[in-house]
């Protein structure tokens, strides 16, 4: 009599995450009499995935009908798989009796479960920096199989090196997840720059995944200021001018201080974009000169972006002889003026 | 579903020459598809893919020799200026449904001879 | 790029008999590795793709293995429909790009 041989032809069998899998098992004889069932992993810990006689397994449905007499097909098909169903699947042979003894074991069928990398998702630092500071973006992506995967970064298109990556867990696992950290120095430049973080897969048939992050988000660009006098009117009135140049984001307000009282306060709003994303603002002050005996001191303060006040101040002198005002006068810088 | 390329023939040196390869039953927005060539008696040789989004990629040996395109139902690799070593027959493939990694559908092939 | 040596270039065995097929990479491609068979003046054929893993309607005769660099295509109980050329294709998942081995002819007696 020739002994009984479970036969699980593929030693392999690859599936897409969702997809049905199909595990093949023959037997070579009807005899001995006695189920068949199907385990995921082998000695005392495996799963048991399959048993005709007994159990629900909603996800599994055998191939042929095995109630059908001489049967001698017991594969198995697995519908909806998941990273989650991996591992090696073994078709076993059990002798009838009270209880059932194990017989055969198939040589068993490897389930390897190829699942696409989730969007990237990339983030920013929480505050914004300034110029020739370096900030950190972080993009992670998850739920991909086999582990094999690469990540790039680029900034306007051009591949960042200073990054570091890493794909967890370490050893076998059902699925994985990447996470990788870029290094970006700002520039004054960047209110338009944007980083992006590509994933490329053995799953993804089209380009790389990408996620972007724009700088916009992460920079600060402090202001210039610029305090000018115009001549004087002949109403004997100044116009002093207090000029503040590419600023970004445009969240600002401005304070003009008459001898430290403070005589107007004006927040930005609907300002018109610069080519590089910045924003300017110019606001003026008019001072009339013959309400003064002594010298006016004009302060243009600039509060941007809730950063500390940064000052600019001007001198009106205030003379006997008003027609010489137009050039009697000085400006002096108080406080740090952050470029 | 099936891939069958066309357009082989007789060329001469540095006379471009596009070869198409037509799909059935699939469609080539949700896959990856490739061009080869097996010279007279060789062995085969991978010349570039076109992504299921149309961004082409090529073997490093290829140097702007080929150009690879594709419509919405046929690929194209356009021979920029062929030489006599490009004589052989060309194939086009599709991914597998699972992974960039292998090729599960060939044509058939189309010959292309390269001579003065 | 990555390069494929294969050998044998050529191997003969007899109908029933076994023939083994090696194919090293020169560099690990993570069993990114697949098996064509090719008959004269037809297209290839998908055998093995993942280094093990059989395609469909592929006969179980055919067996991939292998890890890291180095693979093997087994076929065993050999039928004279299995005189072909096979040839292995990598992929490798940093540079994206495939490279073919030079191929083995089978000659079945």
């Known amino acids: 009599e020739e002994e009984l041989q479970v036969i699980q032809p593929e030693k392999s069998v690859s599936v897409a995450a969702g997809d049905s899998a199909t595990l093949n098992c023959t037997v070579s004889s009807l005899i001995p009499v006695g189920p068949i069932q199907w385990f995921r992993g082998a000695g005392p810990g495996r799963e048991l995935i399959y048993n005709l006689k007994e159990g629900h397994f909603p996800r599994v449905t055998p191939v042929s009908d095995p109630t059908k007499r001489n049967n001698m097909d017991f594969s198995i098909r697995i519908s909806n798989i998941t990273p989650a169903d991996a591992g090696t699947y073994y078709c076993v042979k059990f002798r009838k009796g009270s209880p059932d003894v194990e017989l055969k074991s198939g040589a068993g069928t490897e389930l390897s479960v190829r699942a696409k990398p989730s969007a990237p998702v990339v983030s920013g630092p929480a505050v914004r920096a300034t110029a020739e500071h370096t900030v950190s973006f972080t993009c992670e992506s998850h739920g991909f199989s086999p582990r094999d995967i690469t990540l790039k970064w680029f900034k306007n298109g051009n591949e960042l090196s200073d990054v570091q990556t890493n794909v967890d867990p370490a050893g076998k696992s059902v699925s994985y997840s990447i996470r990788s950290t870029a290094r970006v120095v700002l520039t004054r430049r960047d209110v338009h720059s944007q980083v992006i973080c590509e994933v490329a897969h053995v799953t993804l048939q089209g380009d790389p995944l990408r996620g972007t992050a724009n700088l916009s988000e992460a920079i600060r660009v402090p202001p210039f200021l610029e305090v000018t006098q115009q001549s004087m009117r002949a109403d004997n009135q100044v116009n002093v001018t207090c000029q503040v140049t590419k600023f970004y984001p445009q969240r600002l307000q401005l304070t003009w201080l008459e001898n430290g009282n403070v005589s107007r306060t004006e927040m930005a709003s609907a300002l018109p974009e610069n080519k590089d994303g910045t924003y300017n603002w110019t606001s003026w002050l008019l001072v009339n000169v013959s309400a003064h005996r002594d010298d006016v001191k004009l302060t243009c303060q600039v509060e941007h972006d809730g950063q500390p006040a940064v000052n600019k101040s001007f001198s009106v002198k205030v003379s006997a002889h008003p027609k010489e005002q137009g050039s009697n006068t000085a400006a002096e810088n108080t406080g740090t003026n952050e470029r | 579903q099936s891939v069958e390329e066309s357009g082989g023939r007789l060329g001469t040196p540095g006379t471009p020459l596009t070869l198409t390869c037509t799909v059935s039953g699939f469609s080539l927005s949700s896959y990856v598809m490739g061009w080869f060539r097996q010279a007279p008696g060789k062995g085969l040789e991978y010349i570039g893919i076109?992504?299921?989004?149309?961004s082409p990629y090529y073997a490093s040996w290829v140097n702007g020799r080929f150009t690879i395109s594709k419509t919405s139902t046929t690929m194209d690799l356009k021979m920029n200026s062929p030489t006599t070593e490009d004589t052989a027959t060309y194939f086009c493939?599709?991914?597998?449904?699972?992974?960039?990694?292998?090729?599960?559908?060939w044509g058939p092939g189309t010959l292309v001879t390269v001579s003065l | 790029d990555i390069v494929m040596t294969q050998t044998p270039s050529s191997v003969e065995a007899a109908v029933g008999g076994t023939v083994t097929i090696k194919c090293q990479a020169g560099q690990s491609i993570n069993s990114y590795l697949a098996w064509y068979q090719q008959k004269p003046g037809q297209r290839p054929k998908l055998l093995i793709y993942?280094?093990?893993t059989l395609e469909s309607g592929v006969p179980s005769r055919f067996k991939g293995s292998g890890s890291g660099t180095d693979y093997t295509l087994t076929i065993s109980d050999l039928e004279s429909a299995d005189a072909a050329t096979y040839y292995c294709q990598s992929w490798h998942y940093i540079s994206r790009s495939y490279a073919f081995g030079g191929g083995t002819e089978v000659v079945v007696k």
């Open positions: 076109i992504s299921s989004s149309g």
């Open positions: 993942y280094a093990s």
């Open positions: 493939a599709r991914v597998g449904p699972l992974g960039v990694d292998y090729f599960n559908i």
